[in-house]
């Protein structure tokens, strides 16, 4: 997966810090007070359609075999810069009933975008 | 996540069927002949960027604060209708030292669609 | 501490309609669903809907659908619940509750509001 | 929709003796992550409903330790291990799995 450098306008991972005290989230999360996110950005031309970061899903791949030779409903289909691989992380925070938990949330930070 | 009925135009799961003899890889892939890969398909409008079938990751969330909000970049971020929860599949196929694998294929059959 | 208040007790004719509101202090609004629920005299708990904050996503239980429409303002931590076409049988108290942070619809509710009482009476 | 089914209805008790709820689902509340999506409440007169258990079993912050949630799939057990004065009133248990959300019918728990 591409990481964002200024240069091209191709699909590729921006860094982004997300602080929980500015998005008021710092009310039930405890720990830490803010963490690396990222995002994905730029475009998704057709000849990297179906590109999820450095490997392809068999999906993908798929679905961008009948994106290519124009099938409809396909060719329209747009191609979108998504987060291919999220990384958990570790959080104290309070839970639904109030207690204080410690665990390993999924989806947390994006390593890696491609195109879908 | 939403399955696509023909009324609706917001992020669905659309059914689809690939026959892997039309799409030519029938001269690797020993069975199944073909399966419902399926796609997704629809509209995301900001109300429900960030939702993700029933539940919302932690970082779409995140990214759907911002966006909700305004702010740059994330205002301008397109908000696309991406598989969410993808299904393994197993097949049977040659290798490239044309040895017979019996495998389980990630990533093979889009379960749930939701808005990036 | 968490308080959510709500607004107070209302007589309502039949036909009408009524929106009932739901102020949350002592935190914030946003990563959690807050779910509508009621209970008409001497009867049981009776869930109408919610609506997940962080995306402004409403869902309707089948019974309620074309009749309540639930709402919500960040700027002011608020959400509201509005039903129509009022009946006698609609006669209850109306709870507002908040789930947890980024549960959905799959939310434990910890915090209640104190109940709003709405008569329908011609 | 899922439908609770609670017994007994009305539960008579002494005080310092155990007492045990029963809640029973149309179908499975074990999600596929591992939780069962079942809380039980507690109502006490002319109060606002208050969570007691959680995902089947976990205890809210504040409850006493004498209330434990158990069970899983269709059949969950609440049970107090001695009761105490306070706590009179009727208790629901709710399923989260899917909407519509729904409540069993409750179980009143009077002092004899």
């Known amino acids: 997966g591409l990481e964002c450098d200024g240069k091209v306008n191709i699909c590729c991972k921006k860094q982004f810090f997300v602080s929980f005290k500015d998005i008021g989230w710092n009310d039930w999360i405890i720990a830490p007070s803010g963490y690396h996110a990222n995002y994905c950005e730029g475009e998704c031309p057709s000849h990297i359609a179906g590109t999820s970061g450095s490997s392809l899903s068999f999906h993908s791949t798929v679905i961008n075999h009948y994106r290519m030779r124009g099938h409809s409903p396909f060719a329209n289909l747009k191609s979108c810069c998504v987060p291919t691989k999220l990384r958990p992380m570790s959080m104290l925070y309070y839970d639904d009933g109030q207690n204080i938990i410690k665990k390993d949330i999924q989806n947390m930070i994006v390593e890696e975008c491609g195109c879908s | 996540g939403l399955e696509c009925d023909g009324k609706v135009n917001i992020c669905c799961k659309k059914q689809f069927f690939v026959s892997f003899k039309d799409i030519g890889w029938n001269d690797w892939i020993i069975a199944p002949s073909g399966y419902h890969a399926n796609y997704c398909e629809g509209e995301c409008p900001s109300h429900i960027a960030g939702t993700s079938g029933s539940s919302l990751s932690f970082h779409s969330t995140v990214i759907n604060h911002y966006r909700m909000r305004g702010h740059s970049p994330f205002a301008n971020l397109k908000s696309c209708c991406v598989p969410t929860k993808l299904r393994p599949m197993s097949m049977l196929y040659y290798d490239d030292g044309q040895n017979i694998i019996k495998k389980d294929i990630q990533n093979m059959i889009v379960e749930e669609c939701g808005c990036s | 501490q968490v308080q959510l208040v709500q607004s107070g007790a209302e007589v309502k004719k039949p036909g009408s309609s009524v929106k009932v509101s739901c102020k949350a202090s002592?935190?914030?609004?946003?990563?959690?669903?807050i779910s509508w629920v009621r209970q008409a005299p001497g009867q049981g708990l009776e869930w109408m809907g919610g609506?997940?904050?962080?995306?402004?996503?409403?869902n309707y239980a089948q019974k309620f659908q074309g009749r309540v429409t639930i709402t919500a303002d960040e700027s002011t931590s608020t959400a509201y619940m509005e039903l129509s076409s009022l009946r006698s049988e609609d006669t209850a108290v109306y709870y507002c509750?908040?789930?947890?942070?980024?549960?959905?619809?799959?939310?434990?509710?910890?915090?209640w509001g104190q109940g709003t009482l709405v008569t329908v009476s011609s | 929709d899922i439908v609770m089914t609670q017994s007994p209805l009305s539960l008579p008790v002494t005080p310092g003796e155990p007492a045990s709820i029963s809640c029973r689902s149309s179908?499975?509340?074990?999600?596929?992550?591992?939780?069962?999506?079942l809380d039980w409440y507690l109502q006490k007169p002319g109060q606002s409903p208050q969570l007691l258990i959680y995902?089947?079993?976990n205890r809210a912050s504040g409850v006493p330790d004498r209330f434990s949630g158990s069970g899983s799939g269709t059949d969950f057990t609440l049970k107090i291990s001695r009761v105490e004065a306070e706590d009179v009133g009727v208790y629901y248990c709710?399923?989260?799995?899917?909407?519509?959300?729904?409540f069993g019918g409750g179980t009143k728990v009077e002092i004899k």
């Open positions: 179908q499975s509340l074990l999600h596929s992550n591992g939780y069962n999506y």
């Open positions: 709710m399923q989260a799995l899917q909407t519509p959300i729904t």
């Open positions: 509750a908040r789930g947890g942070p980024l549960s959905g619809w799959r939310a434990s509710y910890y915090y």
């Open positions: 609506i997940i904050l962080t995306s402004g996503t409403a």
């Open positions: 995902l089947g079993s």
């Open positions: 002592g935190g914030s609004f946003s990563p959690y669903t």
